[in-house]
């Protein structure tokens, strides 16, 4: 058993049909000495007395909140968490497997540029009843300091019969070189609690391997005279790190029908500009990766060709 | 994804072209080792991140761009100076720090190509013969380094008279090439930078 | 103390259906992951599928994805085994099994798969 | 598609110590934990060790489980007639939990 927050303990479970469970001693924060019961959630059903309450938490309803009182007054409470470990893994019932980039994906991060800053996100099925707390740091064993805000609702999708909800998270590195070649990485420590069940989430990454531009912005068109060809130009998104000369984009522009099984064309290139042929009723899309460290592209920017 | 093949312009940086070449070995030479040892921990989560040139140089500190002078998380250490005469220094406006930076990467450069040598040779031992470092890497190194042209006292290649433990071997191989790949991304951005100013 | 008894099993030809089941007593049924697990005449232990305690997910082993399906009636304590399409090398005794550390094991039914 | 390898067959004489290896990779032995079963002919199999090298109650203290690094191996120090059976390792891929990976199996056949 460990105290997850004032008056809030976990106790770590074995989870199996008949197992025995662990046997928890609760101690009354009052000077008091007799007099005292001890009561579970609403029921008013004495479940013993005296400064200390021993019980086996075996299943969830030996969980909850206890409460001990002396004639009528709540002198302090404290409440029961249950971890499952299932077979030597801690449960993940809380979370859906986003399995992105791989199985038994449960958070997933992205960094817009360099600075330290990024967000986090997770995916549920659960409406109510549910709380999160994140806590991140640079390295685990002497770790370096990031905070991060408050995880919130930030989407909710209809899939099949049921509703998924999305909780993301932005946290900042507090003294983070854009420059720098990372060595240890950001861990990220998620605390999940579902009713009386809690469970723990982790990720751990760098900055580098979650980068995702922001989509090339000023996208513009110019017909070229007497041609087919137009100039496509765009600009360096407003997030990305500075100097751009230093942290240097590149680009691809692709060519796209309006029938997603038309052929597409795409040019890569480094600069800010490319010509291409415009097909009627064809859009222009153009999207950024970091130049020299190959992770996931920018959303598409696009324009059509009329 | 290949980086795109730059053909510079006479006047062009002269070691501009020489890193993308460089980012390009280095990173075709990680990705086969990936494939070749997948039965040992080579991938960026399951190794130990080492810096062989940590306390030696101070690459990054040293090639700051001028922007990020002003951020003090990126201002940690800066006492490291080196030789400065290179080639690279194409035009009279070079500063001592650019000086600095370009003999500091020359070191770099030195101390990797000391290490993959040394691997090399223990690897061809290995009764296994299941990888080996990409003769073309270390020939991208090598130009590069005549293209910086430092004058350096010449390290010796280390000599090991204990049998190779080639597990072992294969594994700093995995973490050697990791870090390099992560320095020459460095490499790559300062000399656009440079380039550019 | 926990018990899994099943039933279901017996010969069918291929490309027909059956349905397996194994009821649980004992235990609080509705709180734990079941697998099946089958054993082909004088071969290996091969896993089939799980299903969680709420019946909210399930995996299946790739020689049975699209073909059978786990489910599971908390209010009746029984966890089923669907399977259609059969095909002879689908011929083994079927085990349901509970999830954790320690586990139960049930009986065991034996399908077989002939024309 | 079996993952965890055992040796097909191992034998001993009563009072004799004989050991099973099963051998996995970094994804399934190297990350999650090992247990083991005993099968005796016509029966459902029976929990042996878990968490690599737990025994559960009533299991003869002469079964013992190890795992180091990416295999696993189960002794039975002073075999006797009866533990005559197929064995099988049992653990889980990090990729596939709750998926069970099961060893190839060992017959054990006490001689004499």
């Known amino acids: 058993i460990w105290e997850l927050k004032k008056d809030v303990y976990v106790v770590e479970l074995d989870w199996y049909p008949d197992a025995p469970g662990e046997m928890v001693v609760l101690t009354c924060d009052t000077p008091e000495e007799d007099g005292i019961t001890w009561t579970l959630d609403q029921s008013s059903e004495v479940l013993g007395s005296g400064k200390t309450l021993t019980i086996q938490v075996k299943e969830f309803g030996d969980a909850g909140q206890y409460t001990c009182h002396k004639g009528g007054e709540v002198l302090s409470h404290s409440l029961l968490l249950l971890h499952k470990k299932e077979d030597g893994i801690w449960s993940t019932d809380i979370l859906k497997d986003q399995k992105e980039p791989k199985n038994k994906t449960f958070l997933r991060c992205e960094a817009k540029n360099y600075s330290g800053r990024f967000t986090c996100w997770w995916l549920t099925t659960i409406s109510t009843d549910l709380t999160f707390s994140v806590k991140s740091s640079r390295g685990s064993s002497d770790p370096q300091g990031v905070t991060c805000g408050a995880a919130t609702l930030s989407a909710e999708r209809v899939r099949g019969d049921n509703k998924e909800y999305e909780y993301s998270v932005e946290c900042q590195e507090d003294s983070a070189c854009p420059a720098a070649e990372e060595s240890l990485p950001i861990e990220v420590m998620v605390d999940a609690v579902h009713k009386l069940k809690y469970e723990n989430y982790t990720s751990s990454f760098f900055i580098r391997d979650i980068i995702k531009p922001d989509p090339p912005k000023n996208l513009q068109l110019k017909p070229l005279k007497n041609s087919r060809q137009v100039e496509v130009s765009w600009e360096y998104p407003d997030t990305w790190s500075t100097p751009h000369s230093y942290f240097s984009l590149t680009f691809c522009v692709q060519v796209q029908g309006k029938s997603k099984r038309e052929k597409k064309d795409r040019v890569f290139t480094d600069k800010t500009s490319a010509t291409v042929i415009c097909r009627k009723n064809a859009s222009i899309s153009v999207r950024a990766q970091d130049r020299y460290y190959s992770s996931s592209w920018s959303e598409w920017a696009s324009v059509p060709c009329s | 994804r290949n980086l795109p093949v730059a053909t510079p312009d006479p006047g062009m940086f002269p070691c501009l072209h020489h890193s993308q070449n460089l980012l390009r070995a280095v990173s075709n030479m990680l990705q086969k080792a990936r494939q070749t040892l997948e039965f040992y921990p080579c991938t960026s989560e399951e190794i130990d991140h080492e810096d062989i040139t940590k306390d030696k140089t101070s690459t990054v500190e040293a090639c700051l761009p001028l922007e990020l002078t002003k951020n003090e998380s990126c201002l940690n250490s800066r006492e490291t100076s080196f030789i400065t005469n290179g080639s690279c220094l194409a035009s009279r406006k070079t500063s001592f720090m650019m000086a600095l930076c370009l003999s500091s990467i020359y070191e770099d450069l030195k101390m990797y190509q000391v290490e993959f040598k040394t691997m090399n040779a223990k690897l061809l031992m290995d009764p296994k013969r299941q990888i080996f470092l990409d003769q073309n890497m270390l020939a991208v190194i090598d130009e590069l380094m005549q293209a910086l042209n430092f004058n350096s006292e010449t390290v010796p290649q280390k000599s090991s008279l204990e049998e190779p433990d080639f597990y072992k071997t294969k594994i700093k191989l995995c973490i050697l090439l990791h870090a390099f790949r992560i320095r020459a991304v460095t490499i790559d951005r300062v000399m656009s930078y440079l380039n550019a100013s | 103390q926990v018990q899994l008894v099943q039933s279901g099993g017996g010969v069918v030809q291929p490309g027909r259906s059956l349905r397996l089941s194994c009821a649980a007593s004992?235990?609080?049924?509705?709180?734990?992951?079941m697998h099946w697990v089958r054993q082909a005449p004088g071969k290996g232990l091969e896993w089939v599928a799980f299903?969680?305690?709420?019946?909210?997910?399930?995996y299946y082993a790739d020689s049975v994805k699209g073909r059978f399906t786990i489910s599971r009636d908390n209010s009746k304590n029984t966890l089923y085994l669907q399977m259609k399409s059969l095909r002879a090398e689908d011929t083994a005794v079927y085990y349901c099994?509970?999830?954790?550390?320690?586990?139960?094991w049930g009986q065991g039914t034996m399908v077989t798969v002939s024309s | 598609s079996y993952v965890l390898t055992q040796p097909p067959s191992v034998s001993g004489t009563p009072g004799q110590r004989v050991t099973i290896s099963c051998s996995g990779g970094?994804?399934?032995?190297?990350?999650?934990?090992v247990k083991w079963y005993q099968q005796l002919p016509g029966t459902a199999p029976k929990l042996l060790i878990y968490?690599?090298?737990q025994r559960p109650s009533g299991v003869p203290d002469r079964f013992s489980g190890s795992k180091s690094g990416t295999s696993a191996s189960l002794a039975i120090t002073g075999v006797q007639a009866e533990d005559e059976a197929d064995y099988y390792c049992?653990?889980?891929?990090?990729?596939?939990?709750?998926?069970?990976?099961f060893g190839t199996g060992t017959k054990v056949t006490v001689l004499g």
């Open positions: 299903i969680r305690y709420d019946g909210s997910n399930k």
């Open positions: 004992g235990f609080t049924f509705s709180s734990y992951g």
């Open positions: 049992q653990s889980y891929d990090r990729g596939t939990h709750p998926a069970l990976l």
């Open positions: 970094r994804s399934n032995i190297g990350s999650n934990t």
């Open positions: 099994k509970t999830h954790g550390s320690h586990d139960n």
């Open positions: 968490s690599n090298d």
